[in-house]
Amino acid sequence: CKAMHVAQPAVVLASSRGIASFVCEYASPGKATEVRVTVLRQADSQVTEVCAATYMMGNELTFLDDSICTGTSSGNQVNLTIQGLRAMDTGLYICKVELMYPPPYYLGIGNGTQIYVIDPEPCPDSDF
């Protein structure tokens, strides 16, 4: 019996508007009906929560209104989008999946996605 595996891309480049999207996919060892997905940012040895959402299988996942994350779910796959990123937010973003219900609980953690954010150059003033 293998432990739950979570897959996510190694590298993603954020758009010029500071938006990064990636897929978090998990191989479930059980028939979960309630799943929690958390995005964590690891900088040095510090891990902080970026956003989290709980969803019922078959339903959409909903982040809090003030969250910088949005996402959609399809089976054991979650499409995550993080918005409002700046160059200083470049770092390793880890997808954590928890099978919350029914018992038993299972934990799965991805290896992380390195998100690179480049702040856009300000437009030079035009002389007409």
Partner: antibody
Framework: QVQLVESGGGVVQPGRSLRLSCAAS????????MHWVRQAPGKGLEWVAV????????HYADSVKGRFTISRDNSKNTLYLQMNSLRAEDTAVYYC????????????WGQGTLVAVSS | DIQMTQSPSSLSASVGDRVTITCRAS??????LNWYQQKPGKAPKLLIY???SLQSGVPSRFSGSGSGTDFTLTISSLQPEDFATYYC?????????FGPGTKVDIK
């Protein structure tokens, strides 16, 4: 800094009830799974129960299922363990512990509170 | 439920000795394995998390290895303050079981 302080332990007769509390401070309480772990005199560590985040999901060890109830009040940063139908084998030091945000390990523990079930 | 076993259950060693404790899970737990040290009358203290990561403030003589079902805690050079009981614990699936412990005492 992170602090966990248990209270509510004491001597109780078999079949009676007791409620333990764990006051947490120094971190965002609602972002963490909170656990109870116990240790009978001269024995090893035994995981008792966990309550997740918003309090909707709880899991228990078979030895306490149906008798113990874990709960939390995120507005008060407090974790509880309601223990009913107590038995002599429930005699132990009870610790609350914070599950880490990444892989759930216990980097923070309370000092422990002793529950003695005796007639 | 996932069962955790530890060996040996106790060992006698001298200051400066290299000590190895093994922990085995009844099924794969990936790297969700933690090691704790406990001294009499005290709460346990985290040493190693995620099988091989050293907890902040823990001396580098402690190290952990393994993945799947077999794990090891090594103390490279035993110090007087290391005489204690050591527990492994899995944080992969409920119930979050502990191993029975390994008591390290003075030879």
């Amino acid at each position: 800094q992170v602090q966990l302080v248990e209270s509510g332990g004491g001597v109780v007769q078999p079949g009676r009830s007791l409620r333990l509390s764990c006051a947490a401070s120094g971190f965002t309480f609602s972002s963490y799974g909170m656990h109870w772990v116990r240790q009978a005199p001269g024995k090893g560590l035994e995981w008792v129960a966990v309550i997740w985040y918003d309090g909707n999901n709880k899991h228990y060890a078979d030895s306490v299922k149906g008798r113990f109830t874990i709960s939390r009040d995120n507005s008060k940063n407090t974790l509880y363990l309601q223990m009913n139908s107590l038995r002599a084998e429930d005699t132990a030091v009870y610790y609350c512990a914070r599950g880490d945000i990444l892989t759930g390990y216990y980097s923070y523990w309370g000092q422990g509170t002793l529950v003695a079930v005796s007639s | 439920d996932i069962q955790m076993t530890q060996s040996p259950s106790s060992l006698s060693a001298s200051v400066g000795d290299r000590v190895t404790i093994t922990c085995r899970a009844s099924q794969s737990i990936s790297s969700y394995l933690n090691w704790y040290q406990q001294k009499p009358g005290k709460a346990p203290k985290l040493l190693i998390y995620a099988a091989s990561s050293l907890q902040s403030g823990v001396p580098s003589r402690f190290s952990g290895s393994g993945s799947g079902t077999d794990f090891t805690l090594t103390i490279s050079s035993l110090q007087p303050e290391d005489f204690a009981t050591y527990y492994c614990q899995q944080s992969y699936s409920t119930p979050f079981t502990f191993g029975p412990g390994t008591k390290v005492d003075i030879k």
